[in-house]
């Protein structure tokens, strides 16, 4: 299953499959997730080691048993790959690192006014993988405001150095935020020239294209079909690059297919997995296990559940079958692709779905009225769980926020439905940033069921929580995916990085905002909160957040929206915007429904009809 816990001051011994430099443990974990054989990783921050060569070292590891011995190492951080973690699998990494210079091949230098502008330039440059920006206070005046666009053979920095007044980060192309746009066409009987960066075997051009998309240096590809004249080159997928970023020439060639990486697509990228099953095809590779199962789909599920399995072949040969069950060969290779592809066989083959980010039809947990005042504009994909709950009577308007917690589930505040319990009047918009982008043609979700907490009473602040079951499940994308829930009764975690988001009023007597707002707000203890609200009972099922001096808060129209906190690199839904005395008033924190206290209720209500809890636990 999915394991998300990080081990501090611990280093996994042995099992090394690759090493690289990364700016933090989360980026190291992402590289492990996308490496075909990596199950575990260890990261050495600059503070953890004197050896300059090993600072920022990210060590990717494999293990036949799925685990390795941990040794104590002060400052080291270790953890697991996020393979099998559904919607948490993403190559998108937005963080900007202050005080570090990520080294690589500098191929473009320009003057820009901010690090965000530098990141945007990198994202809009086809070859840029990461960048460094010298701030206005950089010690050498001639380098100030310099934006250096960079690449490297592996897509990660060739070195990382601590350097004051320098900020570094990665291209946001994997976040589907590139302005370049992409070529979706696949060209038959055409071969591209230029530099081959890798060679893998694939069953069709679509798998070849997906592998190209997620390869750090592939910009385009040529695939040799299963009837290519040279037998040894059949099913070869050549991943390619060029100085210009486009093929310098193409040659008409029977039984070849060429196309482009989809990394520069805007708003949608292919999933980093291959779900199709190929009848009449055998995939060769290193044998991991052989098991008898009923049907090729069960074989694929078996492969997906066995974390080291990369691909499989389900044999229909009479000698491989007993009654209704046949042999399911679970296999792997060094690069994650078959070492041999044979056609015209009595097998069916396919790939593990361990990197599919759609996950199952579940809500996500982890084991470990009231707009935003004093906030700033959010950007695309920053809060992909945020939804807008709108009511369509004669006109249509935004009333509340909500949080996507599963393909078919939204968590919000019960008081949003005061006087409006009819599910037909509600429209739920997900994957949006600007309310003004909503037109009559914008897709929305309708409500199948509104589940208000049984102990909620109108005009009381208690149990202000409601679940919405959508009529149809939503697909996950970089702009529309769920927030993980905390574990039941989560009281031990100290959250220091919490944000509230919404389209609500920007002042007490204001109006709904167009662009989704965000504000960073500290949590306040319940004791402190109770002192500020002596006329109300602040229960253990509430959580408060706000600045003593006021000025930043949720407000009308934010109700039902998320209070999220980042812990160990993962966002969790800590609270649901519920109530407060006015908005952003001095010594009047906002009050939120404490989600951890309602986990049993959420799990009970989101159980599927067959009684199986629709939960996906990354721990």
């Amino acid at each position: 299953g999915c394991l998300t816990q990080l081990y501090e001051n611990a280093f996994f011994r042995g099992g090394d499959v690759a090493s690289m430099y990364t700016p933090n443990a989360q980026y190291c974990q992402m590289r492990c997730t996308f490496h075909p054989r990596c199950l575990l990783f260890s990261f050495l921050p600059a503070s953890s080691i004197n050896d300059m060569e090993k600072r920022f070292g990210c060590f990717l590891k494999d293990s036949v048993t799925g685990t390795l011995p941990k040794v104590h190492r002060t400052g080291a951080v270790s953890g697991h790959s996020l393979k099998q973690c559904g919607h948490q699998i993403s190559a998108c990494h937005r963080d900007i690192y202050k005080g570090v210079d990520m080294r690589g091949v500098n191929f473009n230098v320009s003057k820009v006014s901010s690090v965000e502008e530098c990141q945007k330039r990198c994202t809009s440059n086809i070859r840029c993988q990461f960048f460094s920006y010298a701030t206005q206070t950089f010690h050498k005046a001639e380098y100030r405001n310099n934006c250096l666009l960079k690449y490297s053979p592996g897509g990660t920095p060739t070195a990382i150095k601590v350097l004051s007044n320098v900020e570094s980060g990665f291209s946001l192309k994997p976040c589907a935020l590139s302005e370049i746009g992409c070529h979706m066409n696949i060209f038959q009987h055409l071969a591209f020239s230029d530099v081959d960066v890798a060679r893998v075997l694939t069953p069709d051009a679509f798998v070849c294209r997906t592998i190209c998309t997620y390869h750090p240096n592939c910009l385009f590809f040529t695939f040799y079909t299963n009837v290519w004249k040279i037998e040894s080159q059949r099913n070869v997928c050549l991943l390619k690059t060029s100085e210009s970023g486009t093929p310098s020439s193409s040659t008409p060639q029977e039984n070849t297919i060429s196309g482009y990486s989809l990394l520069t697509c805007k708003r949608t990228l292919p999933e980093p997995c291959h779900s199709k099953i190929y009848p009449g095809v055998d995939f060769g590779g290193e044998e991991l296990n052989v098991t008898f199962v009923k049907g090729v789909n069960v074989c694929q599920e078996t492969c997906t559940k066995m974390i080291r399995c990369q691909f499989f072949t389900y044999s229909l040969l009479p000698e491989d079958c007993k009654e209704e069950k046949c042999k399911c060969f679970l296999r792997l290779s060094m690069d994650g692709s078959p070492t041999r592809i044979a056609y015209g066989t009595q097998g069916s083959s396919g790939y593990s779905l361990r990197l599919c980010n759609t996950g199952d039809n579940s809500v996500c947990t982890t084991k470990t009225s009231t707009r935003i005042v004093g906030g700033t504009n959010s950007s695309w994909g920053e809060w992909p769980w945020q939804v807008s709950l709108q009511v369509k009577l004669t006109a249509q308007r935004h009333l509340c926020g909500g949080s996507l917690i599963g393909h078919q589930w939204v968590l919000t505040a019960a008081h949003c439905f005061d006087g409006l319990p009819l599910q037909d009047v509600w429209r739920i918009y997900s994957g949006i940033l600007n309310l003004s982008d909503i037109t009559k043609d914008t897709p929305f979700s309708q409500i199948k069921e509104i589940i208000i907490h049984q102990n909620y009473k109108v005009s009381e602040g208690n149990h202000d929580i409601a679940l919405i079951k959508l009529q149809a499940p939503l697909n996950y994308t970089e702009f529309q995916k769920p927030i993980c829930l905390p574990s039941k009764g989560d009281t031990s975690t100290i959250y220091t990085n919490c944000w509230v988001t919404g389209w609500g009023f920007s002042k007490e007597k204001g109006e709904i905002q167009n662009i989704l707002q965000k504000v960073n707000i500290p949590l306040v203890t319940n004791e402190e909160c109770q002192k500020r609200y002596q006329d109300y009972k602040i229960t253990q099922r509430m959580v408060c957040a706000g600045y003593k001096e006021g000025g930043k808060d949720a407000c009308k129209g934010d109700s039902g929206g998320p209070l999220v906190c980042k812990h160990n690199g993962m966002w969790r839904l800590v609270g649901i915007t519920s109530w407060g005395e006015g908005c952003a008033r001095r010594e009047q924190p906002g009050v939120y429904t404490k989600v951890a206290e309602y986990m049993d209720w959420i799990l009970e209500k989101t159980q599927s009809s067959d009684g199986k809890a629709q939960m996906q636990s990354p721990a």
């Epitope: 979706m184 038959q188 069709d204 299963n226 009848p279 229909l316 015209g344 009595q346």
Partner: antibody, heavy 120, light 107 residues
Framework: EVQLLESGGGLVQPGGSLRLSCAAS????????MQWVRQAPGKGLEWVSY????????DYADSVKGRFTISRDNSKNTLYLQMNSLRAEDTATYYC?????????????WGQGTMVTVSS | DIQMTQSPSSLSASEGDMVTITCRTS??????LNWYQQKPGKAPKLLIY???SLQSGVPSRFSGSGSGTDFTLTVSSLQPEDVGTYYC?????????FGPGTKVEIK
């Protein structure tokens, strides 16, 4: 020239049997998975059956499972569909089709079709 | 089985008009979606494979887009020879299924 040519259609009574053939030419037949697709008069396309290149694996639409059998003879470059226990709703034009596998099972080669009428 | 829906079921447009047909699948199929054109009394003809790639020999006025569950076939400038019925088909998982079809006529 790549070609598929169906034959064997005709009028048959409910409960009767019929065997359709599809002769392939112009390509290496044994490399390709083959399909039967049908179309009832005035209606849409319905996938009927599929056979692996080797003939070792087959698949059927629920509507024909247990009554129809797909087979192939790679030495004769021919695909077959044995249809038993025919019903009025099996009345359709039957097409054989194949996919140049690397197009992801898009059917880029089709026959001209053969008409099967089930009526008393 | 993967269910397919197509809209509209029929349309009538003038020569030179842009025509759009949509296809929706009951589950995600990546880009394993194909479009066919069928003229009366003829076998279907592959137009677009892999959601967006033009089959060789097909005029460039035909284009396809989409991934996951929502797909579109666009004819940028309708010609008299484009009259016929258009079908989408998923080739992601067996049984392969077709949409119910969209009949295109010229006004």
């Amino acid at each position: 020239e790549v070609q598929l040519l169906e034959s064997g259609g005709g009028l048959v009574q409910p409960g009767g049997s019929l065997r359709l053939s599809c002769a392939a030419s112009g390509f290496t037949f044994s490399w390709y998975p083959m399909q039967w697709v049908r179309q009832a008069p005035g209606k849409g396309l319905e996938w009927v059956s599929y056979i692996y290149p080797s003939g070792g694996g087959t698949d059927y639409a629920d509507s024909v499972k247990g009554r129809f059998t797909i087979s192939r003879d790679n030495s004769k470059n021919t695909l077959y569909l044995q249809m038993n226990s025919l019903r009025a709703e099996d009345t359709a034009t039957y097409y054989c089709a194949t996919s140049s596998g690397w197009l992801g099972d898009a059917f880029d080669i089709w026959g001209q079709g053969t008409m099967v009428t089930v009526s008393s | 089985d993967i269910q397919m829906t197509q809209s509209p079921s029929s349309l009538s447009a003038s020569e030179g008009d842009m025509v759009t047909i949509t296809c929706r699948t009951s589950r995600r199929i990546g880009t394993y979606l194909n479009w066919y054109q069928q003229k009366p009394g003829k076998a279907p003809k592959l137009l677009i494979y892999g959601a967006s790639s033009l089959q060789s020999g097909v005029p460039s006025r035909f284009s396809g887009s989409g991934s996951g569950t929502d797909f579109t076939l666009t004819v940028s400038s309708l010609q008299p020879e484009d009259v016929g019925t258009y079908y989408c088909q998923q080739s992601f998982s067996s049984p392969w299924t077709f949409g119910p079809g969209t009949k295109v006529e010229i006004k």
